[in-house]
């Protein structure tokens, strides 16, 4: 007869490991007992369990409650055992020693490999601002056994660098993603992808990029000069800009206070029926935590009874 086992048994942390040991005997041969031991190099054999044809299963105190026989029906020639709830410390060499009648004793070894799936974490880098050079966008760390693979999935152009730290029974891998911040990256996903044999599918952690910027400001509403005449209703100026974080708007009049009746509504300045009092220089001040911008326009309210043309100056300042 001969023993059938596996060279390597691989399980994921917390799963049950089946340690196979089957005696393929000739007709009439019987298995008296199967002794299981852990036999790591440099250490003495440590009893795991004994399966006896008459006495049943004996489990070593060190493994009490963790070793069982596979569920029935059981073949009397099958000396396999289940090691419940495998932990990293269970990884190593195991030996089954089978006593048969009349053929004598046989032994076989296997290696138990316990996969420890990683629990990845993603850490964003410092705040990204337009105009910076190459900057850390995020780092992703995953520790497991064996070492996990850490990659990035994104449309954003950047560079990656990885480093690995080996521990006694695992390895930690950290990958960093660097980029040159630009406003086009705003809202773009940056995904850390962790692969590992202990995972059914890759683990993905997505970070949305936020790049601080503030665009030049401009004012709209004075495109048709003829509309700015005495008595006109619904006249308005709108300040145009964009930024991250979203900017706030403030309107002032350079040559005095805002005329009565003029309404400020965020980026919009609304006028009552126009009078010559509304002529003047108006300033839109745009700001966010990153920067601030100004844009100013000159409003000249015309009297339709006058023949002279309307003069408009547009000045933009930063």
């Amino acid at each position: 007869g001969e023993l059938e086992t596996s060279d390597v048994v691989t399980v994921v942390l917390g799963q049950d490991a089946k340690l196979p040991c089957f005696y393929r005997g000739d007709s009439g041969e019987q298995v008296g007992q199967v002794a299981w031991a852990r036999v790591d190099a440099g250490e003495g054999a440590q009893e795991l369990a004994l399966l006896h044809s008459k006495y049943g299963l004996h489990v070593s105190p060190a493994y009490e409650g963790r070793v069982e026989q596979p569920p029935p029906p059981r073949n009397p020639l099958d000396g396999s055992v289940l090691l419940r709830n495998a932990v990293q410390a269970d990884e190593g060499e195991y030996e089954c020693r089978v006593s048969t009648f009349p053929a004598g004793s046989f032994q076989a070894r296997l290696r138990l490999r316990v996969l420890v799936p990683p629990l990845p974490s993603l850490n964003p880098g410092p705040a990204l601002e337009e105009g910076q050079g190459l900057t850390l966008a995020a780092s992703c760390t995953a520790e497991g056994s064996p070492a996990p693979s850490v990659t990035w999935d994104t449309e954003v152009k950047g560079t990656t660098s990885s480093r690995s730290f080996k521990h006694s029974r695992s390895a930690a891998v950290t990958s960093e993603f660097h980029l040159v911040p630009s406003r086009s990256m705003n809202g773009q996903p940056l995904t850390c992808v962790v692969s590992h044999p202990g995972l059914l599918q890759d683990q993905r952690i997505t970070h949305i990029l936020h790049v601080s910027f503030l665009a030049e400001a401009s004012v709209r509403g004075l495109e048709d000069q003829n509309l700015w005449h005495i008595g006109r209703e619904g006249a308005m100026l709108k300040c145009l800009s964009e930024g991250q974080p979203p900017p706030s708007y403030n309107w002032t009049r350079l040559d005095g206070p805002l005329p009565s009746g003029v309404r400020v509504d965020g980026d919009t300045l609304g006028f009552p029926p126009l009078t010559t009092e509304h002529s003047g220089i108006y300033v839109c001040h745009v700001s966010n935590e990153f920067s601030s911008r100004d844009s100013q326009v000159t409003v000249d309210v015309l009297d339709p009874q006058e023949d002279s043309g309307k003069q408009v100056d547009l000045v933009s300042a930063s």
Epitope: Q33, A35, A37, E47, L50, H52, K54, Y55, G56, L57, H58, S60, P61, R97
Partner: antibody
Framework: EVQLVESGGGLVQPGGSLRLSCAAS????????MSWVRQAPGKGLEWVSG????????RYADSVKGRFTISRDNSKNTLYLQMNSLRAEDTAVYYC????????????????WGQGTLVTVSS | DIQMTQSPSSLSASVGDRVTITCRAS??????LAWYQQKPGKAPKLLIY???SLQSGVPSRFSGSGSGTDFTLTISSLQPEDFATYYC?????????FGQGTKVEIK
């Protein structure tokens, strides 16, 4: 036929010492783990000590640990129990018994027993 | 240590009676249980090993059953020579421990 014969029992004062022997015949002595079991007058059976076939890995009941020493001479097919610092509560019939070592620290039931030797500890 | 609890501690029966003695272990011991018979002034004699296996030379009226924590010794038809004290013993762990014994007396 397998025979186990104990000797060395007797009357001893508290604090005294005694050495029990168990001579085995009729089978291969070195194949078996041996143990001592005692029975106080009118009481039940109490395991005292055990020893591997090779003579190592000695085990003791808490009640005798540090006072009793088990040993064997495989060349003489003999088991011993050295008893020191004897107490009145050690008074009992001492039996030697054999069992087969299955693996590690796992044994069969004890299939053969000696007739016993009486140890009396009294002043 | 594993505690072995035997019951009853004594019983009276007549020749031909069916006698049952139970033994409970404080924790699972698979089938690492033996039953011994002891007569006054004599050494214990192995009757049953591995919970249910009959030792060579022991009459078939003796039988054992059970596994784990609960075990039973049955004498199907009590004979005059069966009046004695019976002990169960676990040898799953060291120290091996015995039940307190069951004395079977003539009614």
């Amino acid at each position: 036929e397998v025979q186990l014969v104990e000797s060395g029992g007797g009357l001893v004062q508290p604090g005294g010492s005694l050495r029990l022997s168990c001579a085995a015949s009729g089978d291969i002595f070195t194949n078996y783990s041996m143990s001592w079991v005692r029975q106080a007058p009118g009481k039940g059976l109490e395991w005292v000590s055990g020893i591997y076939p090779s003579g190592d890995n000695n085990r003791y009941a808490d009640s005798v640990k540090g006072r009793f020493t088990i040993s064997r001479d495989n060349s003489k097919n003999t088991l011993y129990l050295q008893m020191n610092s004897l107490r009145a509560e050690d008074t009992a019939v001492y039996y030697c018994a054999r069992a087969e070592l299955l693996a590690f620290d796992v044994y069969t039931a004890s299939d053969y027993w000696g007739q016993g030797t009486l140890v009396t500890v009294s002043s | 240590d594993i505690q072995m609890t035997q019951s009853p501690s004594s019983l009276s029966a007549s020749v031909g009676d069916r006698v049952t003695i139970t033994c409970r272990a404080s924790q699972g011991i698979s089938s690492y249980l033996a039953w011994y018979q002891q007569k006054p002034g004599k050494a214990p004699k192995l009757l049953i090993y591995a919970a249910s296996s009959l030792q060579s030379g022991v009459p078939s009226r003796f039988s054992g059953s059970g596994s784990g924590t609960d075990f039973t010794l049955t004498i199907s038809s009590l004979q005059p020579e069966d009046f004695a004290t019976y002990y169960c013993q676990q040898h799953y762990t060291t120290p091996p421990t015995f039940g307190q014994g069951t004395k079977v007396e003539i009614k």
